[in-house]
Interface confidence: medium
């Protein structure tokens, strides 16, 4: 921000009525009136260029310093070219001297040169040559000097002429202030510029109404330089929750808008499924039936739990069931849907039911599922199972109601036995099998069916209560088709795959485990 100038003295604005002191009296400097741009202007002028040594002084009236520490002196003046005078005016000069004196009182007409301290020799950038003078082109020079620190109640300026042809058209004395400033939503008070060029006065700012220093942020500070300019801003304020920045102020969010934290962002429109907010809202309440999860940002629409999975199928495969479903038709406005599968089993004879989580095996953990299928295995035969698939999202925990779909399936067969060849010889095959332990108690016997590969007319059957059998009296180097099936009280269980096992050739005698 530009410095603010506080004027202490302005000769040009005074219309010739300041009555400055000239020394020696009646010689040298003189108050003159002229016309410029059709306006009367006053100037203090001296032009004793032909008279040898000159020592003409012009002293201002006493100027009250007030709060100024460093003053700036702006001079507007014109100086004639010494060569424009006949004979070149050998004693003519083209500069004058600027002085000042501090005092606690006005000395009136008591002028003492010795009290004055020289500030500088003032030289023009442009002198007025003959042609300019005769054409009445005033070559106006502007020079500025500064003095400080000042300590007394007031001061005088003085101008010493040493033989120049000079006119002072304007003498303006002022000091500088860093103006009152609103920046970064902080208010900085008007501050007097310091007097020492290298130093910067640190000024603390205060946050404007409804603005705060953000957590972990720096308090607002600025530095007031000698020239009255604010420099090096540090820290800032932000509009608090419920308020937004409008120009240099924080304004309450309009009804229907909200802002949930102190930030630079503007108020946001209340999201979908919220009630209209009042002025200055920090959040927007959810409509009835809609909720906001703890981790949901305030800018997110309110959401609700999902509807039940749309379509659920349970396909039984022996002692396994594949559950498949489609996502809910209404997601509740969220994408964080997960599924939970629960299982209940019922005994057909007694009609008793109970949870079956402990006795079945899932292809993946049944809670927090993101996919829409799961396989349940280790099911017991001749049992009724009911599977429940529940859809949940981030706000399901905020309501007591649940969104689920169920599917029931009856397991009528045992799971097919898993068959292995344990050993073989030229005339025998040793075969073993297994079924899931929960189903073993329901099996009465196992039936092993075998025949030569390619012979569809005859086959052999062996029954056993155990989990293995040795098939004897077989032909050497011959492939047999073997299948094992569990027999239960209710009938046949699921048959295993048909396996191809080959006896050894006569050359490869001995019992060989495979």
């Amino acid at each position: 921000a530009q410095g603010k100038e506080v004027v202490l003295l302005d000769f040009a604005a005074a219309g010739g009525e300041l009555g400055w002191l000239t020394h020696p009296y009646g010689k040298g400097w003189d108050l003159m009136q002229n016309i410029m741009n059709d306006m009367p202007i006053y100037m203090y002028s001296v032009c004793n260029v032909m008279s040898g040594d000159q020592d003409n002084w012009l002293r201002t009236n006493w100027v009250y310093r007030g709060e100024a520490e460093r003053i700036f002196i702006e001079l507007k003046f014109t100086v004639r070219d010494c060569n424009s005078f006949p004979g070149g005016a050998s004693s003519c000069k083209e500069t004058f001297n600027l002085y000042y004196a501090e005092s606690d009182l006005d000395y009136g007409t008591n002028f003492q040169k010795r009290l004055f301290t020289k500030i500088d020799t003032i030289a023009p950038d442009e002198i007025t040559v003959s042609s300019d003078f005769e054409a009445r082109h005033v070559k106006l020079n502007v020079e500025e000097r500064s003095v400080g620190p000042l300590t007394r109640k007031g001061f005088y300026l003085a101008f010493q002429d040493i033989g120049a042809c000079v006119a002072l058209l304007s003498v303006r004395v002022y000091y500088k202030k860093c103006p009152e400033l609103l920046q970064g939503l902080a208010h900085f008070p008007e501050t007097i510029a310091g007097s020492d060029a290298p130093s910067l006065a640190t000024v603390a700012g205060t946050c404007v109404d409804h603005a705060v220093v953000p957590p972990g942020g720096e308090e607002p500070r600025m530095h007031c330089a000698v020239d009255g300019e604010w420099l090096v801003p540090i820290g800032q304020c932000l509009c608090q929750a419920g308020y937004e920045k409008v120009e240099d102020a924080c304004q309450a969010c309009s009804p229907g808008f909200f802002k949930f934290e102190a930030s630079e962002s503007p108020c946001l429109e209340c999201p979908e499924h919220t009630l209209p907010s009042p002025e200055g809202a920090t959040s927007c309440e959810c409509e009835e039936g809609f909720f906001r999860a703890p981790q949901d940002p305030a800018s997110m629409p309110c959401t609700r739990p999902p509807s039940a999975p749309h379509y659920l199928t349970a396909v039984g495969m022996g002692a396994k069931v594949e559950l498949r479903w489609t996502p809910p038709q209404d997601s509740g406005g969220r994408e964080d849907i997960v599924y939970s599968v629960t299982c209940e089993q019922c005994w057909p004879e007694s009609g008793e039911c109970g949870p079956c989580e402990a006795s079945v095996r899932y292809s993946e953990p049944p809670h927090g599922l993101t996919r829409t299928s799961v396989t349940v295995s280790d099911l017991e035969p001749h049992m009724n199972y009911t599977f429940t698939v529940e859809a949940r999202n981030g706000v399901s925990g905020l309501v007591t109601s649940r969104s689920f779909r169920t599917a029931s399936v009856s397991i009528n067969q045992t799971e097919p036995p898993k068959v292995r060849l344990e050993g073989r010889s030229t005339t025998s095959l040793s075969v073993s099998w297994s079924i899931p332990p929960p189903q073993q108690s329901r099996v009465w016997k196992y039936e092993v069916t075998y025949r030569k590969k390619g012979d569809s007319n005859s086959y052999n059957v062996r029954r056993t209560e155990g989990f293995s059998v040795t098939l004897d009296d077989l032909a050497p180097d011959t492939t047999y088709l073997v299948q094992v099936q569990a027999l239960t009280q209710e009938g046949q269980g699921a048959g295993s795959k048909v396996h191809e096992f080959q006896t050894l050739s006569p050359e490869g005698s001995g019992n060989l485990a495979v």
Epitope: M32, N34, I35, D38, M43, S45, V46, C47, V49, M50, T78, V79, R80, S84, F85, P86, T128, S130, S131, F133, E134, A135, R136, V138, C165, V166, A167, L169
Partner: antibody, heavy 128, light 107 residues
Framework: EVQLLESGGGLVQPGGSLRLSCAAS????????MAWVRQAPGKGLEWVSR????????HYADSVKGRFTISRDNSKNTLYLQMNSLRAEDTAVYYC?????????????????????WGQGTLVTVSS | DIQMTQSPSSLSASVGDRVTITCRAS??????LAWYQQKPGKAPKLLIY???NLHTGVPSRFSGSGSGTEFSLTISGLQPDDFATYYC?????????FGQGTKVEIK
């Protein structure tokens, strides 16, 4: 006593040339701004040209620009007006006039181009 | 160029009369105006400069006034020696211009 005496007037044909002189005495010629002012028979005064105390700057009325040249010789206290390409409308009494620029020992000039002193004039007639 | 218009172009008056001649500039010339008196066959003489300042040796019955664009020359008690033609002249800009003259004749 200030005296200005013009000479060099006469009859000249259109397109011809004349040189007017003005001899000054009784004052410090080099301090004076000098000018030529003319007056056609039975008409009013018309400013023609001026020259500064040290020989510059020079200025001319639009009606004579490019044809007339003003000059001075301060060592001879004489002012000149060289007139070329003369026209019938240049027929007039030509006065030499002066203003004491000693007044100009000031830092900022007020305009001061009125004429304190005048010569008696010399008649220039342009006719075929 | 600045035009200077004098009025009247001529006037008849008696000795002792108060006579006023006006001069109007086509644009403001502040107070940069002079008045001259010219008698037949003679060179002009300076009467007034800077609109109102009396030139050395000019009788005090002559006075000038005005600024901007309106100026006047007043002869407060006309004398036999005052019958002549009077010219105003602006010197605000380098192209010096004179009025067309006002002839003061004996009534």
């Amino acid at each position: 006593e200030v005296q200005l005496l013009e000479s060099g007037g006469g009859l000249v044909q259109p397109g011809g040339s004349l040189r007017l002189s003005c001899a000054a005495s009784g004052f410090t010629f080099s301090h004076y701004m000098m000018a030529w002012v003319r007056q056609a028979p039975g008409k009013g005064l018309e400013w023609v040209s001026r020259i500064g105390p040290s020989g510059g700057p020079t200025h001319y009325a639009d009606s004579v620009k490019g044809r007339f040249t003003i000059s001075r010789d301060n060592s001879k206290n004489t002012l000149y007006l060289q007139m070329n390409s003369l026209r019938a409308e240049d027929t007039a009494v030509y006065y030499c006039a002066g203003y004491d620029s000693g007044y100009d020992y000031v830092a900022v000039a007020g305009p001061a181009e009125y004429f304190q002193h005048w010569g008696q004039g010399t008649l220039v007639t342009v006719s075929s | 160029d600045i035009q200077m218009t004098q009025s009247p172009s001529s006037l008849s008056a008696s000795v002792g009369d108060r006579v006023t001649i006006t001069c109007r500039a086509s644009q403001s010339i502040s107070t940069w105006l002079a008045w001259y008196q010219q008698k037949p066959g003679k060179a002009p003489k300076l009467l007034i400069y800077k609109a109102s300042n009396l030139h050395t040796g000019v009788p005090s019955r002559f006075s000038g006034s005005g600024s901007g664009t309106e100026f006047s020359l007043t002869i407060s008690g006309l004398q036999p020696d005052d019958f002549a033609t009077y010219y105003c002249q602006q010197y605000n800009v380098y192209s010096r211009t004179f009025g067309q003259g006002t002839k003061v004749e004996i009534k």
